[in-house]
């Protein structure tokens, strides 16, 4: 039975031009992490394996930092960065967590953070 | 010992499909790409596509974007390549290969299939 | 798409002589967060599939005799074979991986003078 749940940042803007960060946490679950996967809409961003390290997706390797931790920098953002991406957790012996954040990239320099929110 | 075993030559004709399979031994199989390359008769070496099993992530040439599907079979460790509308210019031997692209072994295309001769003549 | 260009396209080479292949990359292939070079580069014999040499640049792969090393950086490389051997006689492909599509150069055919 699948126990954990993923806490993540939720919805978030930024300015254009500017950096975010995309974190995950994954509690109330002893199940080791075995990988996570990073995707915007269906398109690799990045996989942190646990045994072999980070891989950056060649279309995005001068726009994308690993970490901190297993969480993920987007740097020079533009406002094509907004919308849904997923942190995808694979987990052994649970299975498969999903935690999704809204990223708006907004062209003043309003940018709020959202609230943090857990998907089950 | 890393081992990727391909499936036999196929002769087709021009308009028709072909499947190839690579079965893969040796190492955890939705860790790494797998790569698909071609080589025409005395030619060069030519990039397809490749999928990553561990999210069925794929990536296609866009020479061959709308012919080609790439898949994978965690359950038996095979990935496929399926290329359609053949031609004549498509006889070449495809040949599968495991992709690490880590950040940190970054080891590129490191174990080869044997290959797999497809002829494509009316 | 990256283009990767070969030189020679064929090399003669006495037993026990240097040989030297050149690779140049339209665009440079170093990824600054780790400061490697994606490229790599492939043995093939008739008959037989390609074989990895070196890896980022001047890695030899397991198993690969060190009379093979490769250097450069940014958009031009090199792969020298030391003292070359009659088992070294081959086709040598330089390949990037920095982006996709990963494209291969057009190859080096390396025999005995």
């Known amino acids: 039975m699948m126990t954990g749940t993923i806490e993540t940042t939720g919805n978030i803007s930024a300015e254009k031009g500017g950096s975010i960060i995309l974190q995950c946490h994954l509690s109330s679950t002893t199940a080791q992490v075995t990988q996570v996967n990073w995707e915007q809409q269906d398109q690799l961003l990045a996989i942190c394996n646990a045994d072999l390290g980070w891989h950056i997706s060649p279309s995005f390797k001068d726009r994308v930092a690993p970490g901190p931790g297993l969480g993920l920098t987007l740097q020079s953002l533009t406002v094509n960065d907004t919308g849904e991406y997923f942190c995808i957790y694979h987990t052994y012996p649970d299975g498969t967590y999903t935690g999704r954040i809204f990223l708006e990239v907004l062209e003043s320099s309003v940018a709020e953070h959202g609230a943090r929110f857990q998907i089950p | 010992e890393v081992q990727l075993v391909q499936s036999g030559a196929e002769v087709k004709k021009p308009g028709s499909s072909v499947k190839v399979s690579c079965k893969a031994s040796g190492y955890t199989f939705s860790n790494y790409w797998i790569g698909w390359v071609r080589q025409a008769p005395g030619q060069g070496l030519e990039w397809i596509g490749d999928i990553y099993p561990g999210g069925a992530y794929t990536n296609y040439n866009e020479k061959f974007k709308d012919r080609v599907t790439i898949t994978a079979d965690k359950s038996t460790s095979t990935a496929y390549m399926e290329l359609s509308s053949l031609r004549s210019e498509d006889t070449a031997v495809y040949y599968c290969?495991?992709?690490?692209?880590?950040?940190?072994?970054?080891?590129?295309?490191?174990?080869w299939g044997q290959g797999t001769l497809v002829t494509v003549s009316s | 798409d990256i283009v990767m260009t070969q030189s020679p396209d064929s090399l003669a080479v006495s037993l026990g002589e240097r040989a030297t292949i050149n690779c140049k990359s339209s665009?440079?292939?170093?990824?600054?967060?780790?400061?490697?070079?994606?490229l790599a580069w492939y043995q093939q014999k008739p008959g037989q599939p390609p074989k990895l040499l070196i890896y980022w640049t001047s890695t030899r792969e397991s198993g690969v005799p060190d009379r093979f090393s490769g250097s450069g950086s940014g958009t031009d490389f090199t792969l020298t074979i030391s003292s070359l051997q009659a088992e070294d006689v081959a086709v040598y492909y330089c390949?990037?991986?920095?982006?996709?599509?990963?494209?291969f150069g057009g190859g080096t055919k390396v025999e005995i003078k």
């Open positions: 290969a495991r992709g690490d692209y880590y950040d940190s072994s970054g080891r590129a295309m490191d174990y």
């Open positions: 390949q990037q991986y920095y982006s996709y599509p990963y494209t």
């Open positions: 665009q440079s292939l170093l990824y600054s967060r780790n400061q490697m070079n994606y």
